[in-house]
Interface confidence: low
């Protein structure tokens, strides 16, 4: 799997879990949320050769395809796969509020 | 959505189905089909900015963040949605075999 | 309509460094291949190398590194550079697109077009 | 590295006869047809006349003609107009080639 096991211990440029942490204040603009201040989202990136992590039969004849056509604009991309939701804490006037967000943290990617 | 009722209508530098016909010889090298000789397949492309038919809220903060953030190389990505298969017609010695490939055709797409 | 055009200096003079720069219209450099090819006065036509939609550059074995291909699809534009230039380097460059068949890029079929009028460099001192 | 050469150099004709130019690839082009013809007449940026070998592309007219496969490549016009004479191209693509494309010398076709 293409998760932080894997990724985070191999220099990997082919599609694979990356870590990002996002700021919410500083990188969303996101004033609203309490705590955390912040968290790990992390984001899917890299080339998806032919037959790395194939997500449908489409994908991997899209690479296939990309293999002997490298020019074409045509290949498939490097996204989430398993995703996970986050607790925050926020206020509606002094009244606080947890609530889970979904699909918040991208856990493995996939080429799509 | 953007499938082809809109996006081959349209000139839409954004993420958008894209026509993309695929001859099973010549783009794959794949001998054994022997009908049909192509199929139009289609692919995903173009750019993801902030809300452009976001897939889930990890992709919504992603582009929110690549919009804060334009240098960072974390950003949705325009991949496939909707999936249809392809019937095709295969020779098993001289016995002909009729068979659904699955997740063949892209029908639309999102930004994940 | 679907448009390149090359602009840079007319003059480098040796030793120097040459940029060139191919502005596109009617297309996003993030779907197409943008070429490099230039043609000495009088000559054949010599493939350079290209930018790929990704962003992959790719050159010509005897560019030995002198050229450097680089895109900011935001302004739409494509850049060659070319260090240590000599006279050998005088010439015209084209920039030129993979073609489009179908709706489809056309991958390595060689097929180039449309092309940009071209810019004549002439190095000299 | 792949060359590509064409012959004869130089072809004088008069308007109304027909036109045979040669390429030859040292080196097999890719899917045996990924070759292409160019028209250049002074001042002006080639023009693609054939592409895959025999395609001709849109707005050219039908008295040209390209064959061929691998490494051995004709373009015919089979009737000479004024506005034939010019400067023809071939160029080969090559997968796995350090060299992605080639061009050949060109041939002249000139009024007799």
């Known amino acids: 799997a293409l998760d932080a096991a894997y990724c985070f211990r191999n220099v990997q440029d082919n599609c694979c879990l990356r870590p990002l942490y996002i700021d919410f204040k500083r990188d969303l603009g996101w004033k609203w949320i309490h705590e955390p201040k912040g968290y790990n989202a992390n984001f899917c990136a890299g080339a998806c050769p032919y037959l790395w992590s194939s997500d449908t039969q489409h994908s991997r004849v899209l690479s296939l395809y990309n293999t002997i056509n490298p020019e074409a604009s045509a290949s498939p991309c490097c996204v989430s796969q398993d995703l996970e939701p986050l607790t925050i804490l926020y206020y509606i006037g002094k009244t606080p509020k947890i609530e889970q967000l979904s699909n918040m943290i991208v856990k493995s990617c996939k080429c799509s | 959505a953007l499938d082809a009722a809109y996006c081959f209508r349209n000139v839409q530098d954004n993420c958008c189905l894209r026509p993309l016909y695929i001859d099973f010889k010549r783009d794959l090298g794949w001998k054994w089909i022997h009908e049909p000789k192509g199929y139009n397949a289609n692919f995903c492309a173009g750019a993801c900015p902030y809300l452009w038919s976001s897939d889930t809220q990890h992709s919504r903060v992603l582009s929110l963040y690549n919009t804060i953030n334009p240098e960072a190389s974390a950003s949705p990505c325009c991949v496939s949605q909707d999936l249809e298969p392809l019937t095709i017609l295969y020779y098993i010695g001289k016995t002909p075999k009729i068979e659904q490939l699955s997740n063949m055709i892209v029908k639309s797409c999102k930004c994940s | 309509e679907q448009q390149l055009q090359e602009s840079g200096p007319g003059l480098v003079k040796p030793s120097e460094t040459l940029s060139l720069t191919c502005t596109v219209t009617?297309?996003?450099?993030?779907?197409?291949?943008v070429n490099w090819i230039r043609q000495p006065a009088g000559k054949g036509l010599e493939w350079i190398g290209y930018?790929?939609?990704?962003?992959?550059?790719y050159y010509a074995s005897w560019a030995n590194g002198r050229f450097t291909i680089s895109k900011d699809s935001s302004k739409n534009q494509v850049s060659l550079k070319l260090s240590s230039v000599t006279a050998a380097d005088t010439a015209v460059y084209f920039c030129?697109?993979?073609?489009?068949?179908?709706?489809?890029?056309?991958?390595?079929?060689?097929?180039?077009?449309?092309w940009g009028p071209g810019t004549l460099v002439t190095v000299s001192s | 590295e792949a060359v590509l050469t064409q012959s004869p150099g130089t072809l004088s004709l008069s308007p109304g006869e027909r036109a045979t130019l040669s390429c030859q690839s040292s080196?097999?082009?890719?899917?045996?047809?990924?070759l292409s013809w160019f028209q250049q007449k002074p001042g002006q940026p080639p023009r693609l006349l054939i592409y895959?070998?025999?395609t001709l592309t849109s707005g050219v007219p039908d008295r040209f003609s390209g064959s061929g496969s691998g490494t051995d490549f004709t373009l015919t016009i089979s009737r000479l107009e004024p506005e034939d004479f010019a400067v023809y191209y071939c160029?080969?693509?090559?997968?796995?080639?350090?060299?992605?494309?080639?061009f050949g010398g060109g041939t002249k076709v000139e009024i007799k």
């Open positions: 030129a697109r993979h073609m489009q068949v179908g709706g489809a890029p056309t991958g390595s079929m060689a097929a180039f077009d449309p």
């Open positions: 009617g297309f996003s450099l993030s779907s197409y291949t």
């Open positions: 930018i790929s939609y990704g962003g992959s550059a």
């Open positions: 080196q097999s082009v890719y899917n045996n047809n990924y």
């Open positions: 895959g070998a025999s």
């Open positions: 160029a080969g693509g090559y997968s796995g080639s350090s060299d992605k494309y080639a």
